[in-house]
Interface confidence: low
């Protein structure tokens, strides 16, 4: 079969499974005159052998671990053994299979881990290696935790990442791990050939000891601290520790207050720097946070609460420069005139607070003193001895004094005897008719006007006159002002009419005074009157049951995904068509007959979180009236983003020749979200051809330092590979370059001559 | 003493396809970040793509999936194949070894895009 097995000499490629026992010929090369033999040379290992004729074979099997790639060449030769063709060369590759186990670097790992640390941060990674193809599942590991000892209520404390083999804790153990109940931990980890997923895969097992250590970096309990302190500041009030020394200790305010009085010292101490005014701010929140020597943040931060402990620092305050009352002529005795309320401003049902009140006087003392009484803790006003008479004193003044346990307050009262009210509202109509409304009608709109009469004094709480409607609306649609002059009612709207739920209402008016009627009056059918308000429909959009909808996902979830839902009714019972709007990224459609969001493309919390778009919903039907509402959806961030040089660093420079190994820092960034801790990059060099001139090392999260290991560098640019790896999950890796230029300088300046460059270097090292 | 040889300029019909070449002399070439600039009437020069030592490769955007850049070590050539050209190509393009604006540049060959 001429083409497959055979052929003229040309440059091939073959690939072959190790192990494989040789059963077959790899080719057959055919000779063009004057060649008559072939002869190979190369990577043979004695294995590969080409017969005069041409045909080449191998003749044993083969092992990729020794050699994954042989480099043969083939020529051809004329009958003096002269080359004639070639060589060419002929590359056979050589297939993996499962033919090594994997084998763990360690038969015993230690390490150690501090309670509450970060669920899934590593705190120690087991290795294993495999001599199979790694990018072949033959090479591909798997690492499991096969038992954790003590096992406490059957809760794992310890989770492996089964590709990296990295150990941390787990949510539960992040929150349970206590070294005073249980000090250490051992795992057995096992790790798999075939990415874990065959039967016939290799394995081998490792021991790892775990101590757990206490972590001091707990919020204290909270403080109490009493109001208008008199002692020197800065008082401590308490303290937090970080678990090694060295820390940088800060408080951050969240709430911006204009006056933020607390420290923290460099031992972790805090103190209340002012004294605290309990009727400004009665409690404090704030957070302690621990930093490294470069800033970066060593842990979540700690919530700090002050309570502020009241003093009795407040007088009792009057409810106003005179409180006026009214009683009518033939009050009873014990009847209620009023209540006077004084305020105090110390904490509430505390002594600091709690109000007494006494009558100190009474003018005029006509008939006689001591007419009123009040409750001494409720400031209730009561009739005390006898009916009054308007004719011999129309007005009363009272000084009450008001006290809490260390105050005393005077407010002043004034009662003013009115006439009896024995008179009742009489409506000047009793049916105000028929009144027919659009339901659109605004609200506000003054419907319908209405009039009662009362025949009592003046002005007074006997001749005011308050409309209520007892009947007819009990949804509150309708309310009434009265004009305090004339006693005129005027009907207004307070909240939308709706045809659908109240096409016709029976509204029934009652009349009342605010002062009670005498003994033996009531109210009669004069003080009531009605009217019947019929509404007419109007054609309504469609409602949304929120005026906002929000719906939270993780941006890498699969296109096609239910994201959320919207739900809308029509007045007029029609049905509902959904769509979207201002959707300008294309990530969402809508279900035009349910309301379900789905997404239909990859979405991104770094383009913008919330995504926010609308949501219209249109009448079938009908006058195809719509509504719009608005749809958030929140996107949960995932590991998608690799890191990146956080700025440009073109222009970098050292002169030429360097006089020492110079190094230079740089920074890296990434566009995920980082809470409270920040990234936690680690840096490498980009490929290992650079480690002779260059060494990179990490200063702390997102800086490292890029150092030169010799001074012997031509006078030209330097492109440095850097891998800058997040350490996410799942870790992404970016790899970013670094030009670094070595040049004659002058006056601490790069200098090239002219037709080199087209800038000019900014930065020297 | 560097020098940096372009050749495979020319003149070319949108949508057409042009490779140009860049022999490198004076360098451990294997060493250097190599790449393309252009320079159009009137405008800064730019760099165009660029290829690192260990082969990775970087495009500026508007010519992102167009244009690629390769190597061959054992030649000391850096190659740029132009696919899918449009009349905006027109410039003069450099060789550039170092891989940025502060790096070596050749003399240029012309392309010129135009129906």
């Known amino acids: 079969q001429e083409g497959k097995f055979s052929g003229p000499l040309k440059p091939m490629t073959f690939s072959i499974y190790e192990g494989q026992e040789p059963s077959q010929i790899i080719f057959q090369f055919k000779a063009n005159p004057p060649a008559v033999t072939f002869e190979l040379t190369g990577e043979t290992d004695n294995i590969f052998v080409i017969e005069r004729e041409g045909l080449l074979y191998y003749n044993r099997a083969l092992d990729r671990e020794t050699r994954s790639t042989h480099n043969l060449q083939v020529a051809a030769l004329d009958a003096n053994g002269i080359i004639v063709e070639g060589p060419v060369p002929i590359t056979i590759k050589v297939k993996d299979i499962n033919d090594n186990r994997p084998t763990f670097l360690q038969s015993k790992y230690e390490g150690s881990v501090r309670q509450n640390s970060r669920p899934g941060k590593p705190f120690l990674y087991v290795n294993a290696t495999d001599l199979d193809d790694p990018a072949t599942p033959n090479g591909q590991l798997y690492y499991q935790i096969v038992i954790q000892l003590p096992m406490i209520n059957n809760v794992m404390y310890f989770q492996i990442n089964n590709k990296t083999g990295a150990i941390s804790l787990t949510r539960e153990g992040s929150q349970e791990l206590n070294p005073a109940k249980n000090p250490s931990y051992n795992l057995v980890i096992s790790v798999k050939d075939m990415g874990g997923q065959s039967e016939n895969s290799f394995s081998d097992t490792t021991s790892v000891d775990i101590i757990v250590t206490e972590n001091i970096w707990k919020a204290p309990k909270p403080v109490e601290m009493v109001e208008n302190s008199t002692d020197p500041h800065p008082i401590k009030i308490t303290q937090v520790r970080w678990n090694d020394p060295g820390a940088q200790y800060s408080l951050v305010d969240k709430e911006k207050l204009p006056r933020f009085p607390f420290s923290i010292d460099q031992e972790g101490d805090i103190y209340v720097t002012q004294p605290l005014d309990r009727e400004e701010k009665d409690a404090y929140v704030f957070y302690a946070v621990a930093k490294d020597e470069y800033g970066k943040p060593l842990s979540y931060p700690l919530e700090i609460h002050v309570k502020v402990k009241d003093i009795n620092d407040n007088p009792p305050t009057c409810p106003s420069p005179v409180t006026v009352f009214e009683v009518q002529e033939n009050e009873r005795l014990g009847n209620s005139i009023g209540t006077l309320t004084a305020h105090d401003r110390d904490e509430e049902n505390t002594a600091n607070s709690f109000l007494n009140y006494r009558i100190v006087e009474q003018t005029p003392k006509l008939p006689m003193d001591g007419l009123f009484l009040i409750q001494t803790y409720a400031g209730m006003l009561q009739l005390a001895k006898q009916s009054l008479k308007k004719q011999d004193t129309p007005q009363y003044n009272l000084t009450i004094e008001v006290s809490d346990k260390d105050f005393k307050t005077l407010c002043f009262v004034q009662i003013n005897v009115i006439d009896i009210n024995d008179q009742i509202p009489i409506f000047e109509k009793s049916d105000y008719g028929n009144l027919t409304l659009a339901e659109d009608t605004n609200i506000g709109s003054t419907i319908l006007t209405i009039q009662a009469t009362d025949a009592d004094e003046p002005f007074t709480g006997s001749s005011k006159i308050l409309y209520h409607i007892i009947k007819g609306d009990s949804e509150g649609r309708l309310g009434v002002d009265t004009d305090p002059h004339t006693n005129t009612g005027y009907v207004i709207i307070k909240k939308p009419l709706d045809f659908e739920t109240a096409a016709v209402s029976n509204i029934v008016f009652k009349a009342e005074n605010p002062e009670p009627l005498v003994f033996g009056v009531k109210y009669n059918a004069s003080s009531f009157a009605k009217f019947t308000l019929i509404v007419t429909d109007v054609n309504e959009a469609p409602q949304f049951s929120q005026h906002v909808f929000q719906a939270k996902v993780s941006e890498d979830v699969a296109i096609g995904t239910k994201v959320g839902n919207v739900t809308a009714k029509d007045p007029e019972g029609l049905d509902i068509s959904y769509s979207l709007r201002g959707d300008t990224r294309g990530w969402l459609k809508i279900d035009h007959v349910t309301g379900e969001i789905f997404s239909v493309a990859p979405l991104d919390r770094e383009a913008g979180s919330p995504y926010r778009v609308q949501v219209v919903a249109t009448e079938v039907g009908g006058s195809s009236l719509s509504s719009v509402s608005e749809f958030h959806l929140i996107l949960m961030d995932v590991n998608d983003n690799p890191p990146r040089l956080a700025k440009d660093y073109t222009g970098l420079f050292f002169c030429h020749p360097l006089s020492a190994p110079g190094s230079l820092i740089f920074e890296a960034t990434d566009d995920d979200q980082h809470l409270f801790r920040g990234p936690h990059f680690t840096f490498s060099l980009g490929s290992g051809s650079l480690q002779n001139d260059w060494e990179v090392s990490k200063i702390n999260g997102t800086h490292a330092r890029l150092s030169t290991r010799h001074t012997e560098f031509e006078e030209r640019e330097y492109v440095v590979l850097i891998r800058i790896n997040d350490g996410g999950r799942p870790p992404l890796e970016g790899i970013v370059s670094l030009p670094v230029t070595f040049c004659s300088c002058v006056e601490g300046s790069c200098f090239r001559p002219a037709g080199h460059q087209t800038g000019i270097p900014t930065v020297g090292m | 003493e560097v020098q940096l040889v372009e050749s495979g300029g020319g003149l070319v019909q949108p949508g057409g396809s042009l490779r140009l070449s860049c022999a490198a002399s004076?360098?451990?070439?294997?060493?250097?970040?190599m790449g393309w600039g252009r320079q159009a009437p009137g405008k800064q020069r730019e760099l165009v793509a660029s290829?690192?030592?260990?082969?990775?490769?970087n495009y500026a955007d508007s010519v992102k999936g167009r244009f690629t850049i390769s190597r061959d070590n054992a030649k000391n050539t850096v190659y740029l194949q132009m696919n899918s050209l449009r009349p905006e190509d027109t410039a003069v393009y450099y060789c550039?070894?170092?891989?940025?604006?502060?790096?070596?540049w050749g003399q240029g060959t012309q392309v010129t895009v135009s129906s």
């Open positions: 550039n070894a170092g891989g940025g604006a502060l790096g070596y």
């Open positions: 290829i690192f030592i260990d082969d990775t490769t």
């Open positions: 004076g360098i451990r070439f294997s060493r250097y970040a």
